[in-house]
Interface confidence: low
């Protein structure tokens, strides 16, 4: 059984067109992985944080399109580290429908460099590791441009990065990695 949480970057670093593509990607991946024992949740972050649906809410309404369609982009600064902490503490929580013995999988979709975040990755990644959260990172748009961004994606992801980091130049290219991500998650579930 897997509990899969999406953490999506809705900050000003994401152009609106790519944000729409991110939503399509999430819906499609959810459809592809939708088995009776897989639950999904989703949080969007910028300098604000919005839980769009919890595992419990997904269980009550397991319709990816209807859950993802109403999401609108927050805009603002890019507080990725705080977002990761919130997912680990709030979404992967039994009060929100997370299951004690399920695999915890976090899929972070981000433009790369965090900005203005009071927390660093060193504040949040060890906690995610302790909680057994397997982290996949998808860098969109600008994330593939700079070495600093690439380094950041590697820091967020579980080790080794080559198995947990995907990079796409734009939202359109997200389609190309849907199957790769699905295969990796199926492999975790055995």
């Amino acid at each position: 059984d897997s509990d899969i949480a999406f953490l999506i970057d809705g900050s000003g670093s994401i152009i609106p067109h790519d944000f729409r593509r991110m939503k399509e990607f999430v819906s499609t991946v959810m459809e592809q992985l939708k088995k009776s024992k897989t639950l999904f949740s989703l949080m969007q972050y910028s300098e604000e944080f919005r839980i769009h649906f919890t595992f419990k809410e997904f269980q009550n309404n397991p319709n990816p399109r209807s859950l993802v369609k109403p999401i609108t982009q927050l805009l603002g600064r890019t507080h990725t580290a705080t977002g990761i902490r919130k997912v680990v503490r709030e979404l992967f929580n039994i009060t929100n429908g997370a299951r004690k013995n399920a695999f915890k999988i976090l899929v972070v979709i981000t433009a790369g460099e965090k900005f203005g975040d009071p927390l660093g990755y060193e504040d949040v990644i060890p906690e995610a590791d302790r909680e057994g959260v397997i982290r996949y990172v998808i860098g969109v748009g600008d994330a593939s441009r700079s070495e600093k961004s690439r380094q950041e994606l590697n820091t967020i992801a579980s080790k080794p990065p080559r198995d947990h980091v995907f990079q796409v130049n734009n939202g359109e290219a997200l389609k190309t990695i849907q199957n790769q991500l699905r295969e990796k998650i199926f492999a975790i579930e055995g």
Epitope: G12, I15, L75, G76, R77, T78, F115
Partner: nanobody, 125 residues
Framework: DVQLVESGGGLVQPGGSLRLSCTAS????????MNWVRQAPGKGLEWVSV????????NYADSVKGRFTISRDNAKSTLYLQMNSLKPEDTAVYYC??????????????????RGQGTQVTVSS
């Protein structure tokens, strides 16, 4: 009224350097990410570089990466573009441009609302 005034352009030989400046007024400069864009003869507007409001974050178009450096002095409300190893294909009118919304780190041309009158950069031997 928002005003952006670019300066520092000129004629330079390939491999040479220039430093462009953009002086801003009419808005709280330190609250806004700023961009440099350029327009080569007969071409459309091309994004060059962006810097965040605080100056801690920057990005560059692939075509200028490693050669151009964007910076800002919020106390002077001035934006800079240091251009090194200039090439003939860098010939263009360079404009500084303000992001529409305060606090947003944006470089999509659709998100820029004001730009200056531009400064001509010509790279030729």
């Amino acid at each position: 009224d928002v005003q952006l005034v670019e300066s520092g352009g000129g004629l330079v030989q390939p491999g040479g350097s220039l430093r462009l400046s953009c002086t801003a007024s009419g808005f709280t400069f330190s609250n806004y990410a700023m961009n440099w864009v350029r327009q080569a003869p007969g071409k459309g507007l091309e994004w060059v570089s962006v810097i965040s409001s605080s100056g801690s974050r920057r990005n560059y178009a692939d075509s200028v990466k490693g050669r151009f450096t964007i910076s800002r002095d919020n106390a002077k409300s001035t934006l800079y573009l240091q251009m090194n190893s200039l090439k003939p294909e860098d010939t263009a009118v360079y404009y500084c441009a303000k992001v529409r919304d305060a606090g947003y780190y944006r470089w999509n041309l659709n998100d820029l609302d004001y730009r200056g009158q531009g400064t001509q950069v010509t790279v030729s031997s």
